[in-house]
């Protein structure tokens, strides 16, 4: 059985079927003879009793007040009364967005971590027997899914899954076609157990060198296990036999991440090694970070401000 409407403040969209179900329903069945009444109050009108004659759009059942459909002028306070039991709701009916398949104010937001299980199931237990078909839309584009009674998405989340998913149930009542829309705003976030990798130290490093000597450029990063760290240089000039990447070293941090170090060794420094960028990059699925080294002849040191130097 559909659970009762316990929330005291409810916002709904005009033009959709809607119901209020009071929370002493089981008790009401026991006391069949007890007088049960539904009331509405809004603005100037105080406690007007509702009955099917009040409006052709309203239907009353034992426990439920149904709207076929709910309209803007249904905004107000609703009361269910039975003996000493009273339940009150404040209903706010908002305007439908005519330019979209959903109304922004009626969206449920969900955050899903990338690679984690992601599920959307289009169900509506209260109207289940009246639903002819159900469609699932992503950003207002219909998704072609096998099951047109209860369309479902079950997968491991990817960043491309982010968007607005709208379940639209189509149903008939008294010869009229209605639809009920439930929209989820799905945001896919980076796996929270992963960090965005970062290179340690300044982003630009001028290194004072002497021609004919060797230099070791150390690139250190904090990264995840599957991330990569590499040097990039000489894109246009082809390979330089004097430049060597040393073996990557890693140490695990107490938090379970990795501290990596990768050295670029430049032997017998020549003119061609000066004033060019040696870039070290750390890359992951969550982003990249790059730092650059420029070799400068020691004699030219005076031309560069002291704070940019790495010795």
């Amino acid at each position: 059985a559909e659970s009762c409407t316990s929330r005291p403040h409810i916002t709904v969209v005009e033009g959709e079927p809607f119901y209020l179900k009071h929370c002493s329903c089981s008790l009401a069945h026991e006391i069949e003879t007890t007088t049960k009444s539904w009331y509405k109050s809004s603005g100037s009108q105080e406690h007007v009793e509702l009955n099917p004659r009040s409006s052709s759009r309203i239907a009353l059942h034992d426990c439920v007040l149904e709207f076929w459909p709910v309209e803007l002028n249904d905004t107000g306070s609703y009361f269910f009364q039975m003996k000493n039991y009273t339940q009150k709701w404040k209903l706010n009916v908002i305007r439908r967005n005519k330019h979209s398949c959903f109304t922004e104010r009626q969206v449920t937001s969900k955050i899903v971590e990338v690679k984690k299980f992601f599920q959307i199931t289009c169900e509506n237990s209260y109207y289940q027997t009246l639903v002819n078909s159900t469609s699932l839309y992503k950003n207002c584009k219909k998704l072609l899914l096998e099951n047109n009674k209860n369309p479902t998405i079950k997968k491991n989340a990817e960043f491309e899954d982010q968007g607005y998913y709208s379940c639209v149930h189509f149903l008939h009542h008294n010869g009229k076609l209605f639809n009920i829309t439930k929209t989820f705003n799905i945001t896919i976030v980076e796996d929270r157990s992963n960090i965005v990798p970062v290179l340690l130290g300044p982003k630009l490093n001028h290194v004072a060198v002497e021609l004919g000597k060797n230099v070791r450029l150390n690139c250190s990063a904090l990264l995840n296990e599957e991330d990569v760290i590499y040097w990039m240089f000489g894109e246009e000039n082809g390979s330089d036999p004097n430049i060597h990447e040393e073996k990557e070293m890693r140490i695990m941090t107490p938090e379970g991440k990795w501290h990596a170090s990768k050295v670029l060794r430049i032997e017998n420094i020549g003119e061609s090694n000066l004033n060019v960028l040696y870039n070290c990059t750390v890359a992951s699925t969550g982003g990249t970070d790059t730092k650059s080294f420029i070799l400068v002849r020691k004699a030219d040191m005076a031309d560069i401000p002291g704070h940019v130097f790495t010795r």
Epitope: V228, A283, T288
Partner: nanobody, 114 residues
């Protein structure tokens, strides 16, 4: 959803050759600088060869003169021609892009016996 499917690995004698392929789907392949990485047992994933969007290749020291990276933008495929293979080249080979990575594929195992 970007998918990377590497293939072409296998068992080969030292001195032999293999050609690896990487089929990329779900993204604009031609806009990405691409690379081959490898991970040997007990070691970290390392960059082996990369190729810019304009087709300029670059290689790690250990494979220079033996490996050749290429790309076919029409087929959304990256290749790695590996010649004069050595036992040290034994690893799982992965392709990915330069920059923010796509999710890694399964890789393809290359085993070079002496």
């Amino acid at each position: 959803e970007v998918q990377l499917v590497e293939s072409g690995g296998g068992l080969v004698q030292a001195g032999g050759s293999l050609r690896l392929s990487c089929a990329v789907s779900g993204s604009t392949f031609s806009d990405a600088g691409m690379a081959w990485f490898r991970q040997a047992q007990g070691k970290w994933r390392e960059l082996v060869a990369r190729i810019s969007t304009s087709g300029i290749p670059n290689y790690a020291d250990s494979v220079k003169g033996r490996f050749a990276i290429s790309r076919d933008n029409a087929k959304n495929t990256l290749y790695l021609q590996m010649n004069s293979l050595k036992p040290d080249d034994s690893a799982v080979y992965y392709c990915n892009k330069i920059g923010t990575l796509w999710y890694w594929g399964q890789g393809t195992q290359v085993t070079v016996s002496s």
